[in-house]
């Protein structure tokens, strides 16, 4: 028998420094977690103790804090090189700055293979990107070889900016021939490493012949066997075992997100490469693990440029700004309310006495809210805090839509409710009631909108044939998160101001904020 230790991260989202327990900015260092310096300590400890170790990343290193805003991926290459990652799969966010923003800072600088079997380059890009990422890589581990085959969410064109010269194929269809190639070279230990979410990870384990282990990302899935060590609630045991169509037991793992945990999986293979056993758990990277001094010193060196960029206080909050995915992808969250209020405030234009304002409505995909802000830091809000909440460098745009399009958008918001998907809408100037007992596509039971042609704003039922102005992220205007109906049916689209700037201006103007959860989004069962 031969034993392999797989260490894995996913959805780190630019958390190079240690963070608070909820993965926002570290306030009390003695209770902070994660960060590359602490990760390196644990990785090195395991490398010294165990013979056959791989360190893998399942994508979405890009995007999430000021580190990415300023360094644009150079920080990812530098620190992943320093930690000596063995391989990385491309995530959707690796394309947030376009293909050039992936090629120059990361693909050309990484000293480890970057993988995706289901992304195919075409046109002039094909020669430019050739060899910079690979479908698979065979790695020598001790006296054996291990094949790593990569995959990326085929939804990436809807979630990021990969451009028109990259084709994202079906994961399973693309993976099988690449695994077959490895099998024809006697590679009998194969890891699928990728970024398509836990449901797809399980399908890959079930359907792709020859894959022994699946290491995933994208859905921020937390798996754990036994009593979990922090706030995350396990979605299943670690590893999650899938029975493949050809009768094998295939372990599937993921390690939550934000560098809070280091996935730790031990696999035992027989001489033919069959998995005999698999066990492990994510390791919570809490303050009991010291930060490596040399990596920490490097972080501090790189940090100087960031400090100049964004440490001035914009204003204060006297309440917790809940931007967690657990809230904003499931229900009304006060961070969503704050952002929507800022978006409307930024568009106050009193140009007609008949209208108190030309626009009253805001919609915002919950998946675009990427971090909370803790008020227990003297209430201070900085640009850096906001860059973690709104890291994508988007704009808040003005569109005109028919009521019927808005109704479709709100149905889409909850069509697969409960899977922590980003399309759940936060709102401003809208009151919506959902009945989740109804079938998808028929769950919006009440949709009232704030009038504009009125001296005293009040909520009236949405009219299907009326044209409304709405402020929303450019991401939604472009059909992101599956909101194709907005892209296809919008009557006018005017691009607006940078998202962080809109919110920072609002906070500076208000000086002290205290957004509440106030019943903009409600749920009912059968009462309408």
């Amino acid at each position: 028998a031969w034993e392999l230790t797989i260490l894995h991260t996913n959805d780190v989202h630019s958390r190079l420094e240690q963070t608070s327990e909820d993965s926002s900015k570290c306030v009390n260092a003695s209770r902070c977690m994660g960060g590359v310096a602490r990760l390196f300590t644990k990785v090195q400890q395991i490398r010294r103790a165990e013979p056959n170790v791989l360190l893998l990343d399942a994508g979405d290193q890009y995007q999430g804090t000021i580190w990415f805003t300023v360094y644009k991926g150079a920080e990812v290459a530098h620190f992943m090189n320093a930690l000596r990652y063995d391989a990385m799969a491309l995530g959707n966010h690796e394309f947030d700055n376009g293909v050039e923003g992936l090629i120059e800072p990361l693909l050309k600088e990484a000293k480890f293979p970057i993988l995706s079997a289901n992304i195919k380059a075409k046109g002039p890009l094909a020669s430019q990107i050739s060899g910079l990422y690979l479908p698979y890589k065979v790695l020598p581990v001790g006296d054996e070889v291990v094949g790593i085959v990569g995959y990326t969410s085929k939804e990436t064109p809807f979630l990021s900016n990969p451009g028109t010269n990259l084709v994202f194929e079906d994961e399973i269809t693309a993976l099988q021939p690449e695994v077959d190639k490895l099998k024809t070279l006697n590679v009998n230990k194969i890891i699928a490493l990728g970024h398509s979410g836990f449901e797809m990870d399980k399908l890959i384990a079930q359907k792709v012949r020859g894959v022994d282990v699946v290491v995933g990302g994208h859905s921020n899935t937390f798996l754990y066997t036994g009593n979990p060590p922090s706030k995350e609630v396990p979605a299943g045991k670690y590893p999650f075992i899938v029975t493949s169509d050809d009768g094998r037991k295939v372990p599937v793992v993921q390690a939550y997100a934000f560098g809070k945990y280091l996935g730790y999986l031990k696999i035992e293979f027989d001489e033919r490469g069959n998995v005999i056993s698999s066990h492990g758990n994510p390791i919570l990277l809490n303050s009991s693990i010291p930060e490596d001094p040399s990596i920490k010193a490097d972080i501090n060196k790189w940090r100087i440029k960031l400090d100049n960029y964004s440490t001035q206080e914009l204003g204060k909050t006297i309440v917790y700004l809940d931007g967690s995915s657990q809230s904003c992808r499931f229900r009304e969250c006060n961070m969503g309310n704050l952002i929507c209020d800022a978006m409307i405030n930024n568009n106050l234009r009193h140009t007609d006495e008949m209208f108190w304002n030309h626009v009253s409505m805001c919609i915002l995909n919950g998946g675009g809210i990427r971090s909370p802000i803790d008020e227990r830091n003297n209430g201070t809000i900085t640009w850096e805090n906001l860059a973690a909440v709104l890291p994508f460098g988007g704009t808040f745009d003005l569109v005109q839509l028919k009521g019927s399009t808005l109704k479709k958008a709100f149905e889409h918001s909850v069509h697969r409710y409960g899977q922590s998907t980003g399309e759940f809408l936060q709102v401003g100037g809208i009151h919506v009631v959902y009945d989740l007992s109804r079938k998808p596509g028929d769950r919006v039971v009440k949709l009232d909108v704030l009038c504009t042609k009125c001296r005293v704003p009040s909520y009236d039922p949405l009219k299907m044939d009326e044209v409304y102005k709405v402020i929303l992220p450019n991401f939604l205007a472009n059909g992101g998160d599956g909101f194709q109906m907005i892209k296809d049916e919008l009557l006018r689209h005017d691009s607006g101001d940078q998202d962080i700037n809109v919110v920072s201006t609002y906070i500076s103007k208000m000086k002290v904020i205290y957004p509440a959860v106030e019943g903009r989004i409600k749920f009912s069962t059968g009462s309408h």
């Epitope: 065979v138 020598p140 006296d143 070889v145 695994v179 077959d180 099998k183 006697n186 012949r209 020859g210």
Partner: antibody
């Protein structure tokens, strides 16, 4: 001793077919992936096709995809290559080769003696 | 496809000479490179695997080095039986590709 013995080559007309065989001895055939590599007269080696140890996975060079089929019969310790729709460009010496495992990954450590396929009218 | 370019294409040398053949890959192939020797009318024979590992039974005068894109095969002191054609081959990405060969002839 460890060896691969080939048969099945010969002269064939364009558009016709041929089947090459490669019999293994001296090692556990079903522990190894196997490949075909060809060499046109006076030219370099060209990889053609490969098959996994159990036969469930196969892969082909673009130049032969859809025309050639690799297969194996582990009970008979035999590797096959079915060559269909042959053209003059397929004229070459065809070698079967064993793919090295683990430490020898990526190298062909045992080769057959080769068999000449000539496609001509 | 990864192109493998060998140089020189042919080489004349004498018994006892030190000879170096180079192989360049069109992209990074790590260490997944093999070297073969082929004599006229015979099948190729594996000499070096993983860029620098000598196959058992192969004389120690043969050595390989390199990683990434640039590789060399060195014969420290040519023997009469070494006159043959030498091929490099990469196994990083399919299709597996070979160099065009270097013919080593007696001067």
């Amino acid at each position: 001793q460890v060896q691969l013995v080939q048969s099945g080559g010969g002269l064939v007309q364009p558009g016709r077919y041929l089947r090459l065989s490669c019999v293994a001895s001296g090692f556990n055939f079903d522990d190894y992936a196997m490949h075909w590599v060809r060499q046109a007269p006076g030219k370099a080696l060209e990889w053609v096709s490969g098959i996994s140890d159990g036969g469930s996975a196969t892969t082909y060079a673009d130049s032969v995809k859809g025309r050639f089929t690799i297969s194996r019969d582990n009970a008979k310790n035999t590797l096959y290559l079915q060559l269909n729709s042959l053209t003059a460009e397929d004229t070459a010496v065809y070698y079967c080769a064993r793919a090295g495992s683990s430490w020898y990954f990526g190298a062909f450590d045992i080769w057959g003696q080769g068999t000449l396929v000539t496609v001509s009218s | 496809d990864i192109q493998m370019t060998q140089s020189p294409s042919s080489l004349s040398a004498s018994v006892g000479d030190r000879v170096t053949i180079t192989c360049r890959a069109s992209q990074n192939i790590g260490s997944w490179l093999a070297w073969y020797q082929q004599k006229p009318g015979n099948a190729p024979k594996l000499l070096i695997y993983r860029a620098s590992n000598l196959r058992s039974g192969v004389p120690s005068r043969f050595s390989g080095s390199g990683s990434g894109t640039d590789f060399t095969l060195t014969i420290s002191s040519l023997q009469p039986e070494d006159f043959a054609t030498y091929f490099c081959q990469q196994a990083t990405i399919f299709p597996l590709t070979f160099g065009q060969g270097t013919k080593l002839e007696i001067k």
